[in-house]
């Protein structure tokens, strides 16, 4: 007779990524008896919460419960009921909430309190909601991609199970771009990390890693755009801002009060003789690039070398996975292929930004105009950040891999966060055990 499979002995975990522009819920699954093995945890579901990021619920925190309902109910459906009580739920809030906390700790605490109260109402094992640091965000993103790429495994393979795998144990660097911050994390080559704030030491699966990380608050794509607008309106002669980062023919009215709402624009704030101004797109990549470069202060560096704004950055080393908005933007622009050189990317951006707005709207009729209008800026910003901010070159560009998913799991900080909080990444290499034969009888 045929072998009959026993019920799977699996575990689940839930992580909510409360980003500046939206919240996503991720459900992870792994075999219970292989908890300490590398690469066994995989994502089974992503649910994007409808609406903005949680920091936008200031003055309406009473709506947070409803906001989270659909995705939490989805988790209830996906995870077997018998597993609900032992499934941990974590919520990590990132730069949107860091910015809110800078403005008012009371408001940020209130948002988190209501989030905690809402999540506690579900049958899962709720483990808390907190604002993670930029350093954690970088570190957990690095852990995620290297875990999924099999970089922590001691077994060398003659075949490649994942794309980008170079079949060595050298880790990938992680480049993460959000709406409000961006992170760069990698293992430098025999280089002292000159600023202690940027140094992390890990021992994972019996190996030591000295990791460099930095999170640039206010340099996520959305906050960078606000910064650029606040900088450029300072020198506008009237309430018209002719903006090279938007397509020719594009027009949008911006409230000055919205512009100065974020702490990220405080350095550019001034009394303007108008309460609104109109962006008029002129679609010029080169001018847009130049405008963006003015956001990076490269004139001051107290270390042997810096990224920008006086932040230490060691020489780049090895391959990098660029994910989150790095991937989403470049994917939209069709620029994620390994074969596309940096020069080609720049050429394509020049062409894209120069396309008239009416033409763009027709070509991408299914895309929301708010998002569609910002791809020229976002693509140009990504190039500026990587080339001038982080000092990638035309040659080292080929070491950047724009990654959405690895083995079906999203690249991002959430998996690393859960692996750490559930103690699933041992410091030492687990003793190899005989293959389990408990799956069949």
């Amino acid at each position: 007779t045929q072998n009959k499979a026993l019920p799977e002995n699996v575990k689940y975990g839930i992580v909510l990524d409360a980003g500046s522009s939206h919240t996503s819920l991720y459900i992870y699954k792994w075999p219970a008896e292989k908890e300490n093995d590398t690469g066994v945890v995989h994502q089974v579901e992503e649910c994007r919460v409808k609406g903005p990021g949680i920091s936008k619920f200031v003055q309406k925190v009473n709506e947070i419960g409803i906001y989270l309902t659909d995705c939490m109910e989805r988790a209830r459906e996906v995870i077997p009921r018998s597993q609900h009580q032992e499934t941990p739920v974590y919520l990590g809030a990132t730069a949107g909430m860091r910015l809110l906390r800078m403005e008012s700790e009371e408001l940020a605490d209130r948002v988190l309190d209501v989030v905690e109260r809402s999540l506690s109402n579900y049958p899962f094992d709720f483990q808390g909601a907190r604002i993670i640091t930029g350093q954690e965000e970088g570190a957990y993103g690095w852990i995620t991609i290297n875990y999924l790429l099999g970089k922590f495994s001691q077994k060398t393979r003659w075949f490649s199970i994942v794309p980008y795998e170079t079949n060595n144990q050298e880790t990938f660097g992680a480049l993460d771009l959000g709406g409000a911050s961006t992170q760069v994390t990698f293992v430098p080559q025999n280089q002292t990390i000159e600023s202690p704030d940027n140094a992390l030491q890990f021992r994972l699966y019996g190996k030591d890693y000295n990791v460099y990380t930095h999170s640039f608050l206010c340099y996520g794509k959305d906050q960078a755009l606000w910064q650029k607008l606040a900088k450029d309106i300072q020198v506008a002669s009237n309430e018209i801002l002719r903006d090279p980062c938007f397509h020719p023919g594009y027009k949008k009215v911006v409230n000055v009060s919205d512009l100065y709402k974020t702490p990220c624009t405080k350095r550019f704030e001034m009394t303007l003789p108008f309460q609104q101004f109109e962006i008029q797109g002129i679609g010029n990549y080169q001018q847009c690039h130049q405008s963006i470069l003015e956001l990076f202060n490269t004139s001051y560096c107290p270390y042997s070398q810096c990224a920008f704004n006086g932040i230490f950055l060691p020489p780049l080393q090895g391959d990098f996975g660029a994910f989150s908005a790095f991937y989403f933007v470049m994917k939209f622009l069709n620029l994620t292929s390994e074969k596309v050189s940096q020069e080609k990317v720049t050429e394509m951006m020049k062409k894209f930004c120069a396309q008239p707005w009416e033409e763009i709207k027709t070509s991408y009729a299914g895309v929301k105009e708010k998002y569609l209008s910002e791809y020229c800026f976002s693509g140009t910003y990504i190039l500026s950040l990587l080339l001038q901010g982080y000092h990638f070159t035309a040659d080292s560009w080929e070491h950047i891999h724009f990654i959405g998913k690895i083995q079906g799991s999203d690249a991002g900080w959430t998996l690393g966060y859960m692996l750490n909080l559930t103690n699933m990444i041992p410091a030492e290499q687990p003793l190899s055990t005989p293959l389990s034969h408990s799956t069949y009888v």
Partner: antibody, heavy 121, light 107 residues
């Protein structure tokens, strides 16, 4: 102490526009929303909607969609109510009221002194 | 819309008495009910939130009770300065609504 001070009484003709101000003091303006409430002569109170002073988001009750507009001047800690194309039935006292979070929900804890608007030809 | 009904438009009482003002919601509003006092020519003053919680500075003689659809504002040991109109208000659902008001007269 917390105060909401509204602009003075207005006498307007039908079809004209009126803009009422509500200046807040004694607290951080952008940490609390602002409600607007109408009270017609001899009548009860009618909630018109509220403005989120942090995000600028507007919420109007159905009866006040169209001719009514809430706005802000954050730097001056001031909220505004503008009524366009005034009608006789807009004759009322208009109150601003702070939207504050108490015990898991939002209430109107402090009120302005009210602005009387009379519409008459 | 949720209708808040204050069935008694006027109530007459004497100084030192205890009086109860009632309010009925057309739908369940939980405890998301507030009470306001409005004296002639003045703006409303917040007395009670969350059905039974007194704002700081509000005298202890004002108490609120109820949940669901039936709510009561009780004034024990009525004082002459309590001469005013009292409004209930639900903030459970948009649009927020008020009761029609109950005028308290002092004999």
């Amino acid at each position: 102490q917390i105060q909401l001070v509204q602009s003075g009484p207005e006498l307007k003709k039908p079809g004209e526009t009126v803009k009422i101000s509500c200046k807040a003091s004694g607290y951080t303006f952008t940490h609390y929303g602002m409600n607007w409430v109408k009270q017609a002569p001899g009548k009860g109170l009618k909630w018109m909607g509220w403005i989120n002073t942090y995000t600028g988001e507007l919420t109007y009750a159905d009866d006040f969609k169209g001719r009514f507009a809430f706005s802000l001047e954050t730097s001056a800690s001031t909220a505004y109510l503008q009524i366009n194309n005034l009608k006789n039935e807009d004759t009322a006292t208009y109150f601003c009221a702070r939207r504050a979070y108490y015990r898991y929900d939002y209430v109107m804890d402090y009120w302005g002194q009210g602005t009387s608007v009379t519409v008459s030809s | 819309d949720i209708v808040m009904t204050q069935s008694q438009k006027f109530m007459s009482t004497s100084v030192g008495d205890r009086v109860s003002v009632t309010c009925k919601a057309s739908h369940n509003v939980g405890t998301n009910v507030a009470w306001y006092q409005q004296k002639p020519g003045q703006s409303p003053k917040a007395l009670i939130y969350s059905a039974s919680y007194r704002y700081s500075g509000v005298p202890g003689r004002f108490t609120g009770s109820g949940s669901g659809t039936d709510f009561t504002l009780t004034i024990s040991n009525v004082q002459s300065e309590d001469l005013a109109e009292y409004f209930c208000h639900q903030y459970n659902n948009y649009p927020y609504t008020f009761g029609g008001g109950t005028k308290l007269e002092i004999k």
